[in-house]
Amino acid sequence: FERTRSLQDPCSNCPAGTFCDNNRNQICSPCPPNSFSSAGGQRTCDICRQCKGVFRTRKECSSTSNAECDCTPGFHCLGAGCSMCEQDCKQGQELTKKGCKDCCFGTFNDQKRGICRPWTNCSLDGKSVLVNGTKERDVVCGPSPADLSPGASSVTPPAPAREPGHSPQ
């Protein structure tokens, strides 16, 4: 069937970057400016995406591929192909309907995007809080209270440093 179709349909010979022009006896015409066709045999070219406002051009449109956008500084991409730009907040904040708001007590956000998340509950793992949480940082859990016998150090000494990729002697 494919072979038959290509014999009958001159449009199948039109390469990417062109379209099959019905107004000109199905001649393969180049895509007009600001349009593209990414596959062969197209009867029309698609309009190039325009990166406007907070969207900036990451890759220019060509006759065979669409433009690609990202976001200007202070914003980050959301959605497939950067279909949205969302304003950054500071660490320790989240974007709400009323703008960037500080994380509530007991929550943190260590990024400029996303939502505030609850601090880790160390006691669920039978551990104690070694370092308190902040708006920007999660708590650090330490050994369980039972491990902290009098005189015992509450912090495990670090392992001796070694070069990456080397096994311990």
Epitope: R49, K52, G53, V54, F55, C69, F75, L78, C82, S83, M84, C85, E86, Q87, L95, T96, K97, K98, G99, C100
Partner: nanobody, 122 residues
Framework: EVQLVESGGGLVQPGGSLRLSCAAS????????MSWARQAPGKGFEWVSG???????YYTESVKDRFTISRDNAKNTVYLQMNSLKPEDTAVYYC????????????????WGQGTLVTVSS
């Protein structure tokens, strides 16, 4: 064809006022949410304010109680009344459609005006 044309920018002294207008055409304005953004010289964009089709308004913290967004659906125009202007309000102000209805978020299908420059200086 969608068009957004801003006007009303200019030079104003600190503490002064300006009213920006954005005339819209080429789409159903009355059912569209609209927004204002700004870009200070050498800096990134900042979401300033937004207004839903029903009239609910939203502002970024730094302009709250100083700026007022409003709309006139009969004139297909959205306004930004700016009072108590500060030097840090100096920027190019852009009008844009606001299809996401989410604070600080614009989508690729939103339309943008060319901007109007507001300079706050003595």
């Amino acid at each position: 064809e969608v068009q957004l044309v801003e006007s009303g920018g200019g030079l104003v002294q600190p503490g002064g006022s300006l009213r920006l207008s954005c005339a819209a055409s080429g789409f159903t304005f009355s059912s569209s949410a609209m927004s204002w953004a700004r870009q200070a010289p050498g800096k990134g964009f900042e979401w300033v304010s937004g207004i839903y089709s029903g009239g609910s308004t939203y502002y970024t913290e730094s302009v709250k109680d100083r700026f007022t967004i409003s709309r006139d659906n009969a004139k297909n125009t959205v306004y930004l009344q700016m009072n108590s202007l500060k030097p840090e309000d100096t920027a190019v102000y852009y009008c844009a459609t606001w299809g996401t209805l989410r604070f600080g978020v614009w989508a690729e299908y939103d339309h943008w005006g060319q901007g109007t420059l507001v300079t706050v200086s003595s």
